[in-house]
């Protein structure tokens, strides 16, 4: 899917109003030096692709988070404010479905979210440069 | 240009109704979200409910549920919020918002409907007041 025209500002609105606050909750215990951001992205575009990677794709050592509020809320938000993104995913989710697994905080997920997080703040600072 | 009108507001006794409208013109009304809030001195600007205007999907405030009640007249553009079974609690300043892309997105709305910063147009707003 091709985020370009994404309403960023009502995506930044609703990571300002609540998601980011699940994402805290999620890790809350977890100090937030405790993982290094290896994941960035350059633009806004680019950081939602990053975003909906992490957040949707299951990865080695953590098999999904699709089912967390904060992930709930972002594919809401994608599918709101970003025209054509809910029928992308139809065929996403039903394999989604198919796999679900039971829910397991595992510090490869804590790790993972922390890149979220890190990926998140940057969404917001579209137009500071990339280090 | 856009309008948001809001009237209906006055001056209730506890246990007493009151039914505010909002009248909307300028814009596409059956795609569009149209949302109360509601704001007392001192505080935040609170959700109270929204109505998408494309399907009728209604959404509540736990403090309001089932006293207050939305709907849509999508012939005359606008949103009514019927409130019965008034508290002191409620006296505020009562407003209307509309947003162009959750009225067609009615069940991902459920978790942001309740947010003010979302909205893109807001009325003048019109003042309630409960007395006890």
């Known amino acids: 899917y091709d985020f370009t025209n994404c309403d960023f500002e009502k995506i930044k609105a609703a990571y300002l109003s609540t998601i980011s606050k699940d994402l805290i909750t999620y890790m809350s215990g977890t100090k937030s030096t405790e993982f290094n951001n290896t994941v960035s992205c350059s633009n806004r575009p680019h950081c939602l692709t990053e975003i909906q990677s992490l957040t949707f794709n299951p990865t080695a050592g953590c098999a999904s988070l699709a089912k967390e509020m904060f992930a709930m809320k972002t594919k809401a938000a994608l599918a709101i404010w970003c025209p054509g993104y809910s029928e992308t995913q139809i065929n996403a989710t039903q394999a989604m479905k198919k796999r679900r697994k039971r829910k397991v905080t595992t510090n490869k997920c804590l790790e993972q979210v922390s890149q979220l997080q890190g990926l998140w703040r940057r969404f917001n600072r579209p137009l500071l440069k990339q280090q | 240009q856009v309008q948001l009108v809001e009237s209906g507001g006055g001056l209730v006794q506890a246990g007493g109704s009151l039914r505010l409208s909002c009248a909307a013109s300028?814009?596409?009304?059956?795609?569009?979200?149209i949302a109360w809030f509601r704001q007392a001195p001192g505080k935040e600007r609170e959700g109270v409910s929204f109505i998408s205007n494309s399907d009728g999907t209604a959404y509540y405030a736990d403090s309001v549920k089932g006293r207050f009640t939305i709907s849509s007249d999508n012939a005359k553009n606008t949103v009514y919020l019927q409130m019965d079974s008034l508290k002191p609690d409620d006296t505020a300043d009562y407003y209307c918002?509309?947003?162009?892309?959750?009225?067609?997105?009615?069940?991902?709305?459920?978790?942001?409907?309740?947010?003010?910063?979302?909205?893109?147009?807001w009325g003048q707003g019109t003042q309630v007041t409960v007395s006890s």
């Open positions: 300028g814009f596409s009304f059956d795609d569009y979200a």
């Open positions: 918002a509309a947003e162009g892309r959750m009225g067609t997105h009615s069940r991902d709305s459920v978790y942001f409907w309740s947010f003010s910063a979302l909205y893109d147009y």
